[in-house]
C-alpha cells in the first residue's frame, strides 16, 4: 500500500505564438481545479476507462478575474498535493491523465458550471520511494508543469511497496536471514511469505505462498521476461539460465490477457484490451465498484446489472461518458432558432432570443405590432422581427413622438430657401431654378428642360414639397 502524490507547479500559456485566451473574465470569474487518474501498466486506454489505480480531485484554486487587455498569465493554483492512495503493490509502470477543470462563478442559475480546459496524459516508469520526478506536458496552447512521486505507507517498503517492515524484536540485530529495512534501520524486513523461489526483483506477494509478477515478467516464479530482449541467438532455443523466451513467437502468443481480454502488440511490448469490469496489465483485476467513486461531475453510481459490469454512472444533464467525464456541447446542435444565441449553463440550455422572437428555443415569432402604438397618426409596420412606425408628415423617431424639422437636412438645392410648413416643407428657389427641391434649371427661353411646372405656378414661385 502507498500513496501517489502529484504537485502542480504551474498551468498557463505554453511557449510560442498563439497564446490562449484567459479562461476567466471580469464577467465570468472562475477558478481552477485538477483531476488525476491513474491506471496500472502502460495501457493506452481511452480517457474514460476506469482509473484502476485510483483518482483524486484537487481543492479549488483562488478565484481569478482576467485583467482586461492582459495576456493569460500562469493561473492561480489550488493549495496542496493531489494524493491517490493505492491498496496493492505499486506497479512500477503506470499511465496518468491530468485534467485541468474550470469552475465558472458567474451568475449562472443553479450554481457554478464546470468545463474541461485541458487534458494531458502519459505513461511513465516510477519506483516507489524515489525522488520527485518533474514533468512538463502541453495540451494545445496550454502548458502544465508538475512533479510526482510514489511513496509506500508503513509497514510497506521497496520499489513496489511489497516488502514489509516490522519493529525489531531485539535491539541489536534482525532475525536470521532478515535484513534491516533501509532507510528505517531500526526496523527489520518481515519474514518472506511468498512462494519459494519467487523472484525478489520481479515478483511480489500479498498472500502467503503466492507469486505475482511485476509488469514485463511472467512465469510461476516471475523469472521469465515477457520481451525477448535477453535472447542472444536470433533463432536459438529457450535458455534455461536466462529464463529467455524462444524468439519468433510474439508477445501475444498464448494470449497473456486474462478474463477474455484481447492482446495486441505494441512497438515494444503488448497491450490487453479488457472486457468491462476488468482492468490491469493483463485484465487480471476485477471489480471497480461504486465505493471507488468512479463517477465524475455529480454522476450517480449504481451497481451493474450483470457480473461483467461492476458499476454504471448515471450522468447529470450536460455530461456523458462511462464515467460522466465528458461535457456535452449541446449548443453544437444549434437548438436556438431564428438566430438565437445558445448558452450551455451545464444544468440547462438557455437561448437568448433576438428581438421579435421568444420561447425556450426562440421558436415563437412575436406579433411585432401587438400592443405597440405609433403616436401622432403614425402606422405600425411589421417585419424582420422588429416593429417600426411609418410616421405622418412632420413627425419622426421610433414611435413618431419626435417633431421633425423638415429643413434640417437642407433639402432645397441650388441655394433655395427652406420653410417649414404644417404639411411638410416649402422650397423658395433661387432665380433660374424650379422644382419641389429647386432641382431643375430654367432654360433662358422660359421653357423647362424637365417636366413643366404644375398649372398656376410660375418658375421662381415657392414650391411646396408634399
Amino acid at each position: 500500500a502507498g500513496v501517489f502524490e502529484l504537485q502542480i507547479h504551474s498551468f498557463g500559456p505554453g511557449p510560442g505564438p498563439g497564446a490562449p485566451r484567459s479562461p476567466c473574465s471580469a464577467r465570468l470569474p472562475c477558478r481552477l481545479f485538477f483531476r488525476v487518474c491513474l491506471k496500472p501498466g502502460l495501457s493506452e486506454e481511452a480517457a474514460e476507462s476506469p482509473c484502476a489505480l485510483g483518482a483524486a480531485l484537487s481543492a479549488r484554486g483562488p478565484v481569478y478575474t482576467e485583467q482586461p487587455g492582459a495576456p493569460a498569465p500562469d493561473l492561480p493554483l489550488p493549495d496542496g498535493l493531489l494524493q491517490v492512495p493505492f491498496r496493492d503493490a505499486w506497479p512500477g509502470t503506470f499511465s496518468f491523465i491530468i485534467e485541468t477543470w474550470r469552475e465558472e462563478l458567474g451568475d449562472q442559475i443553479g450554481g457554478p458550471a464546470w468545463s474541461l480546459l485541458a487534458r494531458v496524459a502519459g505513461r511513465r516508469r516510477l519506483a516507489a520511494g524515489g525522488p520527485w520526478a518533474r514533468d512538463i506536458q502541453r495540451a494545445g496552447a496550454w502548458e502544465l508543469r508538475f512533479s510526482y512521486r510514489a511513496r509506500c505507507e508503513p509497514p510497506a517498503v521497496g520499489t513496489a511497496c511489497t516488502r514489509l517492515c516490522r519493529p525489531r524484536s531485539a535491539p541489536s540485530r534482525c532475525g536470521p536471514g532478515l535484513r534491516p529495512c533501509a532507510p528505517l534501520e531500526d526496523e527489520c524486513e518481515a519474514p518472506l511469505v511468498c512462494r519459494a523461489g519467487c523472484s525478489p526483483e520481479h515478483g511480489f506477494c500479498e498472500q502467503p505462498g503466492e507469486c505475482r509478477c511485476l509488469e514485463g515478467w511472467t512465469g510461476p516464479l516471475c523469472t521469465v521476461p515477457v520481451s525477448t530482449s535477453s535472447c542472444l541467438s536470433p533463432r536459438g532455443p529457450s535458455s534455461a539460465t536466462t529464463g529467455c523466451l524462444v524468439p519468433g513467437p510474439g508477445p501475444c502468443d498464448g494470449n497473456p490477457c486474462a478474463n477474455g481480454g484481447s492482446c495486441s502488440e505494441t512497438p515494444r511490448s503488448f497491450e490487453c484490451t479488457c472486457p468491462r469490469g476488468f482492468y490491469g496489465l493483463r485484465c487480471e483485476v476485477s471489480g471497480v465498484t461504486c465505493a471507488d467513486g468512479p463517477c465524475f461531475n455529480g454522476g450517480l453510481c449504481v451497481g451493474g446489472a450483470d457480473p461483467d459490469s461492476a458499476y454504471i454512472c448515471h450522468c447529470p444533464p450536460g455530461f456523458q461518458g462511462s464515467n460522466c467525464e465528458k461535457r456535452v456541447d449541446r449548443c453544437s446542435l444549434q437548438p436556438c432558432r431564428n438566430g438565437g444565441l445558445c448558452l450551455d449553463l451545464g444544468h440547462a440550455l438557455r437561448c437568448r432570443c433576438r428581438a421579435g422572437f421568444a420561447g425556450p428555443r426562440c421558436e415563437h415569432d412575436l406579433d411585432d405590432c401587438a400592443g405597440r402604438a405609433c403616436a401622432n397618426g403614425g402606422t405600425c409596420v411589421e417585419g424582420g422581427g422588429a416593429h417600426r412606425c411609418s410616421c405622418a408628415l412632420g413627425f419622426g423617431g421610433r414611435d413618431c413622438r419626435e417633431r421633425a424639422d423638415p429643413c434640417a437636412a437642407r433639402p432645397c438645392a441650388h441655394g433655395g430657401r427652406c420653410y417649414a410648413h404644417f404639411s411638410g416643407l416649402v422650397c423658395a428657389c433661387a432665380p433660374g431654378y424650379m422644382g419641389a427641391r429647386c432641382e431643375f434649371p430654367v432654360h433662358p427661353d422660359g421653357a423647362s428642360a424637365l417636366p413643366a411646372a404644375p398649372p398656376g405656378l410660375r418658375p421662381g414661385d415657392p414650391q411646396r414639397y408634399l
Epitope: 525477448t228 511490448s269 497491450e271
Partner: antibody, heavy 124, light 106 residues
C-alpha cells in the same frame, strides 16, 4: 549529423531472397531508446511498415509478412539487415530504413530520420 | 488491424490558403504521426505525438486530435508545401499508414 542509407540488389528474381542492409551514422543502436525500422512503398502507392528492431533486440514484424521477414542488427558496424524470402513481383517497391526513437523505453516517440530509399524490382 | 483513412485523398489549393487534412483511425489510438513526401524523395517527419513539431518544420504546420480523429493543418500554404501527406499510428501491430493525401497547386 544523422544519416541512414539502404543498400542491396536492385533486381531480384521471383522466389529468391532479398537481403537489404541499412548503414547508419550519428546514433548508436547500443543507446537505450534507439531503434531502426523498415518501410516500403510500391510505385504510386502508400507507405507500408515492415519490421523494426530495438537497441535491446526486441523485434516486431508485420503480421502479414512475418513468416518471410527476419531483422537483425550489428551494433558494432552500425548496421541493420532485413531479409525477405520468397520474393514476388508484388514486392516491387522502394524500401526505406528509418531511425525510431522510443520515449520511456516503451512507446514510440518518432520515426524521425529516413534513408533515401532503394528501389527493388522483382522480375524474372 | 487499425485502418487509417485520410481525407481528402487529394486536394487543390493556392499559396496562402489554410488547409486541413484529417486522419480517422478505425479504433482509438493515443497519438498520431504525420509525414510529408515529395516525388522521388523519402518521407519527412512533420508531427509526432499528435501535436509536436519535428525539428526544422515551420510553425505553419500543426497537428491536433485524439481518440480516432486527428487533423493536420497548414495555416498558410507555401509553394514548398505541395506534396503528399501520410498519417501513421504506433498503437498496435501492424503499425499502419494512411493512404495519403496529395496536395496540389490550384
Amino acid at each position: 549529423q544523422i544519416t541512414l542509407k539502404e543498400s542491396g540488389p536492385t533486381l531480384v528474381k521471383p522466389t529468391q531472397t532479398l537481403t537489404l542492409t541499412c548503414t547508419f551514422s550519428g546514433f548508436s543502436l547500443s543507446t537505450s531508446g534507439m531503434g531502426v525500422g523498415w518501410i516500403r512503398q510500391p510505385p504510386g502507392k502508400a507507405l507500408e511498415w515492415l519490421a523494426h528492431i530495438w537497441w535491446d533486440d526486441v523485434k516486431r514484424y508485420s503480421p502479414s509478412l512475418k513468416s518471410r521477414l527476419t531483422i537483425t542488427k550489428d551494433t558494432s558496424k552500425n548496421q541493420v539487415v532485413l531479409t525477405m524470402t520468397n520474393m514476388d513481383p508484388v514486392d516491387t517497391a522502394t524500401y526505406y530504413c528509418a531511425r525510431i526513437v522510443s520515449f520511456d523505453n516503451d512507446h514510440v516517440s518518432a520515426m524521425d530520420y529516413w534513408g533515401q530509399g532503394t528501389l527493388v524490382t522483382v522480375s524474372s | 488491424d487499425i485502418q487509417m483513412t485520410q481525407s481528402p485523398s487529394s486536394l487543390s489549393a493556392s499559396v496562402g490558403d489554410r488547409v486541413t487534412i484529417t486522419c480517422s483511425a478505425s479504433s482509438s489510438v493515443s497519438y498520431m504521426y504525420w509525414y510529408q513526401q515529395k516525388p522521388g524523395k523519402a518521407p519527412k517527419l512533420l508531427i509526432y505525438l499528435t501535436s509536436n513539431l519535428a525539428s526544422g518544420v515551420p510553425s505553419r504546420f500543426s497537428g491536433s486530435g485524439s481518440g480516432t480523429d486527428f487533423t493536420l493543418t497548414i495555416s498558410s500554404l507555401q509553394p514548398e508545401d505541395f506534396a503528399t501527406y501520410y498519417c501513421q499510428q504506433w498503437r498496435s501491430n501492424p503499425f499502419t499508414f494512411g493512404q495519403g493525401t496529395k496536395l496540389e497547386i490550384k
